[in-house]
Interface confidence: low
């Protein structure tokens, strides 16, 4: 029931740190694999509407108390579902506060009228660098510079889930001009707001801007891939980067495309196609197994970008670890 | 809930020896275990842990020397080349973040040619 | 890595009389302290967890506190029985600390 979950610290009742209650008593979700689906389901179980993101628990105000247990370590969901609870869940003890999921939803009694209903950064290497865009029925629109400040980009970064802004003097690609509409300019944001929508703006699509005056936003990517235990950069064993950590790949349906997206993404040139022997004369990692069931087309620029299961999510031992030998 | 430790024995230096935890009560889709030893006359000493989703964590002393690993009601650690200095009782525990922990009695593990 | 210091190493204390050891965590670890009693040739016996959390047949004269990065048990009204090696656990896994659930060095009470 509604009462049993609840979002908090956020600017309205539809934004903040995720808390469910277990026998009368409010813990905070853990992180590992919370994604759009899980939220969509919360935003539908609190009457939200659509979900909008899925911000760090730790942006929102007061934190969770050190003492607050952490009640559910991973949520599942299909999207379908009517409430969390009829999600698969784990219950475990190796998840900090740190780690708390945050939720936001588009909030339907909210007094901003139109809502957006997303943005991205376009025409970028990767989801975390690029031109500004915001969604509104249907329709991308791109944001002027006028007004826009490194504030703002921290409210972009922290609704993609990209890390932190990076101060930036790019211009957008004068070939990847934007051909949409202009959504706004002034954007006057503190840099807390949950998201982009919430920054108070001139008025809606009345501007004099034009598209030289798009606005290019990077972000620290908190995504990153090395290969490690070999002679140079371009072979070993696989780890990315997520959530500050290092962690491997499972070699589950991993195979020739996979590895020309590493080598490629690495600029290590072309997969030289290893053997099962070559591959396993790294060793097994330790700590975190990051990604599994890994699905690359082979013309992805990034690892980032093929499909995989959720993060953490795996049934691999270090055994199964990846490797990764380039042509360098 | 309990946990028991077997598998214990004499072994040569180099040989493999893997060690067994059985634990009733409680699930391992819903707590970590560690594994602990304990040298004739030293102090604790902590191994590593695999935790529910089956990733393992060791000391850094451990790393190599040790393996981890479960099915659903077992948790098994493997010496993978024993030396004398692996001579003491190990020990199973849950630990106990947010639950009590919980012992084993342990097992002796005697190293020697 | 995660370290645990425990102070002292050793200490010898009166019957009815008092004695303090502290557990110093390298890193935060929140309530996350375990604190064991065991004497020769037994597993260890769990006196505290959660910092503060007195186990389950254990008396009121063991007392555990602090959170954070200091904690301390307190044995008062010091029994002949209470002899023994007193050893801290961090119980706080986070990929911070990756998952080391360490020891302190151990105190050894001697009852005189």
């Known amino acids: 029931s509604p009462s049993g979950v609840r979002l908090v610290g956020g600017l309205h009742r539809c934004e903040g740190r995720v808390e469910v209650e277990q026998k009368g008593q409010w813990g905070t979700v853990c992180d590992d694999g919370w994604d759009i689906k899980d939220v969509a389901v919360l935003c539908r179980e609190l009457g939200c509407g659509a979900a909008s993101g899925t911000p760090s628990g730790i942006l929102y105000e007061p934190p969770a108390e050190k003492e607050q247990k952490v009640l559910i370590q991973s949520v599942s969901c299909t999207g379908t579902e009517d409430t969390l609870a009829q999600c698969e869940q784990e219950e475990v003890y190796d998840c900090s506060h740190d780690e708390d999921a945050g939720a936001s939803c588009e909030n339907p009694e909210s007094s901003f009228s139109p809502v957006p209903e997303g943005v991205r950064l376009a025409d970028g290497p990767g989801h975390c660098k690029g031109r500004v865009e915001v969604k509104h029925q249907n329709q991308w629109y791109t944001v002027c510079q006028t007004g826009w400040s490194l504030r703002a980009a921290k409210v972009v970064c922290r609704q993609l889930g990209c890390g932190r802004a990076v101060l930036t003097q790019k211009r957008c690609n004068k070939h990847a001009y934007g051909r949409k509409p202009i959504w706004l300019s002034q954007m006057s944001c503190s840099g807390r707001e949950a998201t982009l929508q919430d920054c108070p703006s001139g008025p809606w699509g009345k501007n004099t801007c034009n598209h030289d005056e798009d606005t290019w936003v990077e972000c620290e990517d908190p995504f990153d891939l090395r290969l490690v235990g070999g002679d140079n950069l371009c072979s070993g064993r696989l780890e990315v980067l997520h959530k500050g950590v290092w962690g491997s790949v499972c070699d589950d349906n991993w195979g020739e495309k996979e590895d020309q997206v590493v080598c490629k993404q690495l600029g290590c040139g072309k997969s030289l196609s290893p053997s099962f022997r070559d591959r396993k004369c790294y060793g097994p990692g330790v700590g975190r197994i990051w990604l599994d069931n890994v699905r690359c087309s082979g013309e992805e620029q990034s690892l980032e970008q093929c499909q995989h299961r959720f993060w953490g999510f795996h049934d691999c031992t270090h055994q199964e670890d990846v490797a990764v030998i380039c042509s360098g | 809930q309990s946990v028991k430790e077997s598998g214990g024995r004499l072994v040569t230096p180099g040989t493999p020896l893997t060690l067994t935890c059985t634990v009733s009560?409680?699930?391992?889709?819903?707590?970590?275990m560690t594994w602990v030893r304990q040298a004739p006359g030293k102090g604790l000493e902590y191994i590593g842990v695999?935790?529910?989703?089956?990733n393992t964590y060791y000391a850094t002393w451990a790393t190599g020397r040790f393996t981890i690993s479960k099915t659903s009601t077992t948790v098994d650690l493997k010496i993978t080349s024993p030396t004398t200095e692996d001579t003491a009782t190990y020990f199973c525990?849950?630990?106990?973040?947010?639950?009590?922990?919980?012992w084993g009695q342990g097992t002796l593990v005697t190293i020697s040619s | 890595e995660l370290d645990l210091t425990q102070t002292p190493a050793s200490v010898s204390a009166a019957v009815g009389g008092t004695v303090t050891i502290n557990c110093q965590a390298s890193e935060d670890i929140y309530s996350g302290l375990t604190w064991y009693q065991q004497k020769p040739g037994q597993p260890p016996k769990l006196l505290i967890y959660r910092a503060s959390t007195l186990a389950s047949g254990v008396p009121p004269r063991f007392k555990g506190s602090g959170s954070g990065t200091e904690f301390t048990l307190t044995i008062s009204d010091l029994e002949c029985d209470d002899a023994a090696t007193y050893y801290c656990q961090n119980n706080y896994g986070s990929s911070s600390n990756n998952y080391v659930f360490a020891f302190g060095g151990g105190t050894e009470v001697e009852i005189k």
């Open positions: 525990a849950r630990p106990g973040y947010k639950s009590v922990p919980l």
């Open positions: 695999i935790v529910t989703s089956g």
């Open positions: 009560g409680f699930y391992l889709s819903t707590h970590g």
